[in-house]
C-alpha cells in the first residue's frame, strides 16, 4: 500500500501522470492497446508501476465500474496457487482454470478470468502518486 500520507484527506493530493486515473490512494493506467501478460508487466515496470494488484473486494468492485466485457491483464498468476505479484494469495475472490495453460489472471466488469499468458489483452497498471513509494 502507499505510505506516507493519507491522500484522501490531504490538502493538496499528489497528482497522477498524464493518461493515468487517480482513484483513492493510487494511480491506475488502463491500456488502449493489447499485449501478452509478460509484455504488459514490462510496460508497467518501465513506468515505476506494476500490473494491477487488487487488495480487496471493495477495490475490485470500484475498478470494475471502469471495465467492459473485454478482459484486462492484472498482476495475478498461478504458481502452485493463485498469487498476486506482491506475493500475497488471492483470498477474496475465486478464479478457476479450465486448462493447464491458463496460468495468468485477467479481469473484466464481471470478474476474474484465468487465461493463457500469451493472449494479447488490454492491461491495468497501478502505482502510487509518488514513484519512490511502495508499488502495491
Amino acid at each position: 500500500l502507499c505510505q506516507g500520507s493519507n491522500y484522501s484527506t490531504c490538502a493538496s493530493c499528489p497528482s497522477c501522470p498524464d493518461r493515468w486515473m487517480k482513484y483513492g490512494n493510487h494511480c491506475y493506467y488502463f491500456s488502449v492497446e493489447e499485449k501478452d501478460w509478460n509484455s504488459s508487466l514490462e510496460f508497467c515496470l518501465a513506468r515505476d508501476s506494476h500490473l494491477l494488484v487488487i487488495t480487496d473486494n471493495q477495490e475490485m468492485s470500484l475498478l470494475q465500474v471502469f471495465l467492459s466485457e473485454a478482459f484486462c491483464w492484472i498482476g495475478l498468476r498461478n504458481n502452485s496457487g493463485w498469487r498476486w505479484e506482491d506475493g500475497s494469495p488471492l483470498n477474496f475472490s475465486r478464479i478457476s482454470s479450465n486448462s493447464f495453460v491458463q496460468t495468468c489472471g485477467a479481469i473484466n466488469k464481471n470478474g476474474l478470468q484465468a487465461s493463457s499468458c500469451e493472449v494479447p489483452l488490454h492491461w491495468v497498471c497501478k502505482k502510487c502518486p509518488f514513484a519512490d513509494q511502495a508499488l502495491f
Epitope: F71, N98, S99, Q102, A106, S115, S116
Partner: antibody, heavy 120, light 107 residues
Framework: EVQLVESGGGLVKPGGSLRLSCAAS????????MSWVRQAPGKGLEWVAT????????YYPDSVKGRFTISRDNAKNTLYLQMSSLRAEDTAVYYC?????????????WGQGTLVTVSS | DIQMTQSPSSLSASVGDRVTITCRAS??????LAWYQQKPGKAPKFLIH???TLAEGVPSRFSGSGSGTDFTLTISSLQPEDFATYYC?????????FGQGTKLEIK
Amino acid sequence: EVQLVESGGGLVKPGGSLRLSCAASGFTFSRYYMSWVRQAPGKGLEWVATISISGGNTYYPDSVKGRFTISRDNAKNTLYLQMSSLRAEDTAVYYCAREGGYGNLWFAYWGQGTLVTVSS
Amino acid sequence: DIQMTQSPSSLSASVGDRVTITCRASENIYSALAWYQQKPGKAPKFLIHNVKTLAEGVPSRFSGSGSGTDFTLTISSLQPEDFATYYCQYHYGIPFTFGQGTKLEIK
C-alpha cells in the same frame, strides 16, 4: 464466421511423410491455440497435437510424439502438421480445430477434415 | 493418463424420448469435461464445456451434469436431428482424451 479448411491429405506409403495445412479465416488466428484431432475409419476421436499462440509450445500424445510436428504461420493464418515415419494406424481423417479462447482447450470449431491413407 | 469411458456404446430411442449418456473418468477431473456431437461424414460439433455450459447456439434440450469422475449428457426430448454419435472429452491437461463414443440411433 469461423472457417477452418484442411488440405494436403492423400495416399502415402508406410514410412513416408506428408504435410497437412489448415487455412483459417473469420477470426484473429494469432489469438488462439490450435490443434489437430484425427479419426480412423469407423473409430472414435483422437487428439494429435496442440500449439500455443506464438508457436513456442507444442504438445503431443505418445502415439505421435517424435513423428509428427505441429507448426503455425500467424502471418498466413495457417496451421500445419508435418507427419513422418507414417504407419498404417495413422490412416484417418485429420481435423484442424480451434480452442474456445483464452487458452480454453476444448475444441470449439472444427474444419471439415482431410483424409490421410497410409498403405503400400 | 486419464481414460474416459462412455456408456452405453450404442442406444436406440424414439423422437420425444429423454436420453442420458454417461461418461466416466479414470480419476477426478473436477469439471474439465466437454461434449461433442458427430453425424456421419461430418466434423464433430462442440456442445458443452465445463460439464454443463452450453456452447453458443446449442438447444436448451441438451444439458450436462456431474463432477469428479461421473458425468452425464441428457437430451430432454429427442429431435430427429439429434440422432448422432456423442463424445465426451477431458479438456484440462495433456493428453486430451476422448471417450469412445455413444451412437444414438432411431428405434
